[in-house]
């Protein structure tokens, strides 16, 4: 059928909760773009009728809730006018593991996801809730420990839980709650959140080490496609931000109308001591302006460039 | 591997300073956190504190005005010390690594302890 | 504090046994529990940390339970290496506190 396979990696979910998926896969979803949900390799695509409990909402997957049977690999197809993509999501989908009835009622979920708060510092922890526009989501709760937090250290700020003078003690089983309503119906949803304390050895936060680029020009012929990475090396309980500018704007802001040039999705290798993080800039087609200017690749407080210019010309060919 | 070695005067006099020193090999004190306990002849175990992979540290709060915990990365050494000593702090005195994990905090590895007497 | 007690001061058993201490503690303290060995020679070891967490190379017959306030520590078949005092301690509030203790002795 002509569509290129891309495979993302496994999403594993709790049961009885919505959840819901966005297919965006930059720069192919960038232009005009026609979005198709399917599961298991299905000919009929997932329906986008609201009612259902398993529809599409323009570019998302959305589930209502999330039900034990939903496992599977899902594709969802990108068609743009020259081009056709097919991502792979695959989706496993667990039983909660509720708190002991003598400790309270909230479930202890452990590894959903892991958040890390520094000793001594004002810090957060962030709810992950990520849901298409149809969905609209009330206050969010917090709980430790299956119970809820109170106290002067902890204060909710929208999708946050911010932290003041870290302890210690502030490590455990988090838990976010929110309700969310759609088409007149209300769920529940509730993220488990694994937290544990670290301090920075030493004075200071760490400083991240761009590898590459290095402060260099790159050759590169007129209206190609060209993608360039941005390696870091970074500690693993970093919170640097990693991204690429022009003009100290980021590039997806300041090509926001043509989106000729687009940051990619990070990824990142974990070793022992250290996170290996790659986030590449893309130029879908090279032009005139784009030659002199340096790109920058940010990371915390480090930067390194790449400046385009054209080939030497090749003086053999006359 | 990993191990833990405790060095300590034996015998102080009352109202006088204990002074310990916990020397550890086969770890790096910048990814563990190290703690205190003591132990009373035939008795039970007294956490005294812990000091963390930076410089943070936790006392016991019926000892902490009189507490103190130290150490040195690069030498790969940590210091108690013990102010105004009673005969009731007659005990054998451990160093022991945390987990380093930041979520249980449980002592996965001991020194053999050093017995320290406050006598006259 | 937190006070932790372990109502058993000694135990006596065969070898081949299944024993259980126990260990309270006198409020929620979630799983923040971990269990200790000290030998007669006063050696220490971690034996399970976060209530039912094995630590490496701790033989399998032993393992922990527990929420809240109740613990236990279970040796599914004695052996004669297992003759020690056994701590249980919390780390879920500052100060950290220990059990008071139980001797397992042989019969």
């Known amino acids: 059928d002509g569509c290129k396979d891309i495979f993302m990696k496994n999403e594993i979910l709790s049961a009885s909760q919505p959840f819901a998926f966005n297919c965006t896969f930059p720069p192919i979803t960038s232009g005009e773009v026609s979005v198709t949900w399917y599961k298991n390799s299905s000919k009929i695509p997932v329906s986008k009728i609201i009612q259902s409990r398993i529809h599409q909402d323009e570019t998302w997957i959305l589930f209502l809730p999330m039900e034990w049977g939903d496992s599977g690999v899902y594709q969802c197809v990108i068609k743009g006018r020259d081009s056709c993509h097919r991502i792979h999501v695959n989706l496993t989908v667990f039983e909660k593991h509720w708190c002991d009835t003598s400790i309270g009622g909230l479930p202890n979920l452990s590894d959903e996801y892991k958040q890390i708060l520094h000793l001594g510092k004002d810090d957060s922890l962030t709810c992950h809730l990520h849901f298409p526009k149809s969905c609209v989501l009330g206050p969010i709760k917090w709980y430790k420990d299956c119970n809820e937090i109170k106290g002067e250290r902890f204060t909710v700020l929208e999708t946050r839980l911010l932290v003041s003078n870290v302890s210690a003690e502030d490590r455990g089983n988090y838990a976010c709650q929110a309700i969310l309503t759609h088409s007149g119906k209300q769920y529940e949803v509730l993220n488990g959140i694994t937290v544990s304390i670290t301090e920075r050895a030493g004075y200071g936060g760490s400083v991240p080490k761009i590898i590459y680029p290095k402060n260099h020009s790159i050759e590169v012929q007129l209206g190609t496609t060209l993608i360039v990475d941005c390696n870091v090396t970074d500690t693993k309980d970093n919170t640097n931000l990693r991204c690429w500018r022009v003009n100290n704007t980021l590039v997806d802001d300041y090509y926001d109308e043509s989106k000729r040039i687009r940051e990619g999705v990070e990824t990142h290798v974990s070793f022992r001591e250290h996170n290996l993080y790659t986030v590449n800039i893309t130029f879908l087609e090279v032009k005139m302006e784009d030659y002199g200017l340096p790109f920058m690749c940010h990371a915390g407080v480090s930067t390194a460039y790449i400046i385009l210019q054209l080939p030497a010309p090749d003086f053999r060919a006359y | 591997q990993v191990q833990l070695k405790e060095s300590g005067p034996g015998l102080v006099a009352p109202s006088q300073s204990l002074f310990i020193t916990c020397t550890v090999s086969?770890?790096?004190?910048?990814?563990?956190?190290i703690n205190w306990v003591r132990q009373v002849p035939g008795k039970g175990l007294e956490w005294l504190g812990v000091?963390?992979?930076?410089?943070?540290?936790n006392y016991n709060s019926a000892l902490i005005s009189r507490l103190s915990i130290s150490k040195d990365n690069s030498k790969s050494l940590v210091f108690l010390k013990m102010n105004s000593l009673q005969t009731d702090d007659t005990a054998i005195y451990y160093c022991a690594r945390g987990t380093g994990t930041g979520f249980y905090y449980a002592m996965d590895y001991w020194g053999q302890g050093t017995s320290v007497t406050v006598s006259s | 504090d937190i006070q932790m007690t372990q109502t058993t001061s000694s135990l006596s058993a065969s070898l081949g046994d299944r024993v259980t201490i126990s260990c309270r503690a006198s409020?929620?303290?979630?799983?923040?529990l971990n269990w200790y060995q000290q030998k007669p020679d006063g050696t220490l070891k971690l034996l399970i940390y976060?209530?039912?967490g094995l630590h490496s190379g701790v033989p399998s017959r032993f393992s922990g339970s527990g929420s809240g306030t109740d613990f236990s520590l279970t040796i599914s078949n004695l052996e004669p290496e297992d003759i020690a005092t056994y701590f249980c301690q919390q780390d879920s509030k500052f100060p950290w506190t220990f059990g008071g203790d139980t001797k397992l002795e042989i019969k």
């Open positions: 976060y209530t039912s």
């Open positions: 409020q929620d303290i979630y799983k923040y």
């Open positions: 086969g770890f790096s004190l910048s990814s563990y956190e």
């Open positions: 000091i963390w992979t930076g410089i943070t540290t």
